[in-house]
Amino acid sequence: MMTGTIETTGNISAEKGGSIILQCHLSSTTAQVTQVNWEQQDQLLAICNADLGWHIYPAFKDRVAPGPGLGLTLQSLTVNDTGEYFCIYHTYPDGTYTGRIFLEVLESSVAEHGARFQIP
């Protein structure tokens, strides 16, 4: 039975040209995290494997930085970066937990962070 929950940074916004940290946190389970995948609309951005460390996909190597922790930092943001991002926690023995973050990249300087929320 999967008892864990993923807390994410929720709905967030950031300025064009700036950077943002995407963060997820898995709690309420003793399952071992074997890997975390970061994806954007079915595109793989990066993974963090417990054995091998971080792997950033070539298409994003200039604009994605690993961390902090199991989070991901997006740099040099463009309006095209607006959209859904997913953190996918591969765990043993529970299986897979998925968290969702919606990022809006704004032209103006009115970028506010949204509230944190939980995804069961």
Partner: antibody, heavy 115, light 110 residues
């Protein structure tokens, strides 16, 4: 882009053989790299992988005689005491072990071991 | 030790036909399964990852399916350019393995 820079060629069983894979246009500080070989007319044979953190994993048959190491832009495969059974085309590729595939691949280099 | 068994070793198919290649893992690999195409003198090319997702630039006539221990690569509306050897590869584990690849399937297009 992945390039296999070192040339293959003829090697003796007494040689220590080192192949170098160069990744152009990006650092390997956040990449996994795999080595795969293919004997003439045979299938693909996985040798091993190195993570961004420097951790390595090898096929059971490759443990001890094969060593994978890396710098920020190159990955090396060292073969000690090569035998005629090591005659193959050697490929390096980015990724592996849950990166959802190895991609891209280097063109490969043919290594011939003969006494 | 996960062992990948690929069948058939060789298959002949007419242009426009359909070919199915199977890959069986000796234990569950949880859809950590990729397919590659290799033509003579070339390195392998990633076709399908995570059992069913099409790699960038791969034609939609290629499709993957399966879960657990049984996986399938299907090529529908085969073209002459599809003549190649196809390999499955498991990414579930790299500890205590002899090979992560299946033995390969040669597809001959008539």
């Amino acid at each position: 882009q992945v390039q296999l820079e070192s040339e293959g060629g003829l090697f003796k069983p007494t040689d220590t053989l080192t192949l170098t894979c160069t990744v152009s246009g990006s650092s390997l500080s956040s990449s996994y790299m795999s080595w795969v070989r293919q004997a003439p007319g045979k299938g693909l044979e996985w040798i091993g992988i190195i993570g961004s953190n420097g951790n390595t994993y090898y096929a059971n048959w490759a443990k001890g005689r094969f060593t994978i190491s890396k710098t920020s832009t190159t990955v090396e495969l060292k073969i000690t005491s090569p035998t005629t059974e090591d005659t193959a085309t050697y490929f390096c590729a980015r990724g592996g072990y849950r990166t959802s595939g190895m991609d891209p691949w280097g063109p490969g280099t043919l290594v011939t071991v003969s006494s | 030790d996960i062992v990948m068994t690929q069948t058939p070793a060789s298959v002949e198919v007419a242009v426009g036909g359909t070919v199915t290649i199977k890959c069986q893992a000796s234990q569950s690999i949880s859809s950590y399964l990729n397919w590659y195409q290799q033509k003579p003198g070339q390195p392998p090319k990633l076709l399908i990852y995570d059992a069913l997702k099409l790699a960038s630039g791969v034609p939609s006539r290629f499709s993957g399916s399966g879960s657990g221990t049984e996986y399938t690569l299907t090529i529908s509306g085969v073209e002459s350019a599809d003549a190649a050897t196809y390999y499955c590869q498991q990414e579930h584990s790299v500890g205590n393995v002899d090979n992560v690849f299946g033995g390969g399937t040669e597809v001959v297009v008539k």
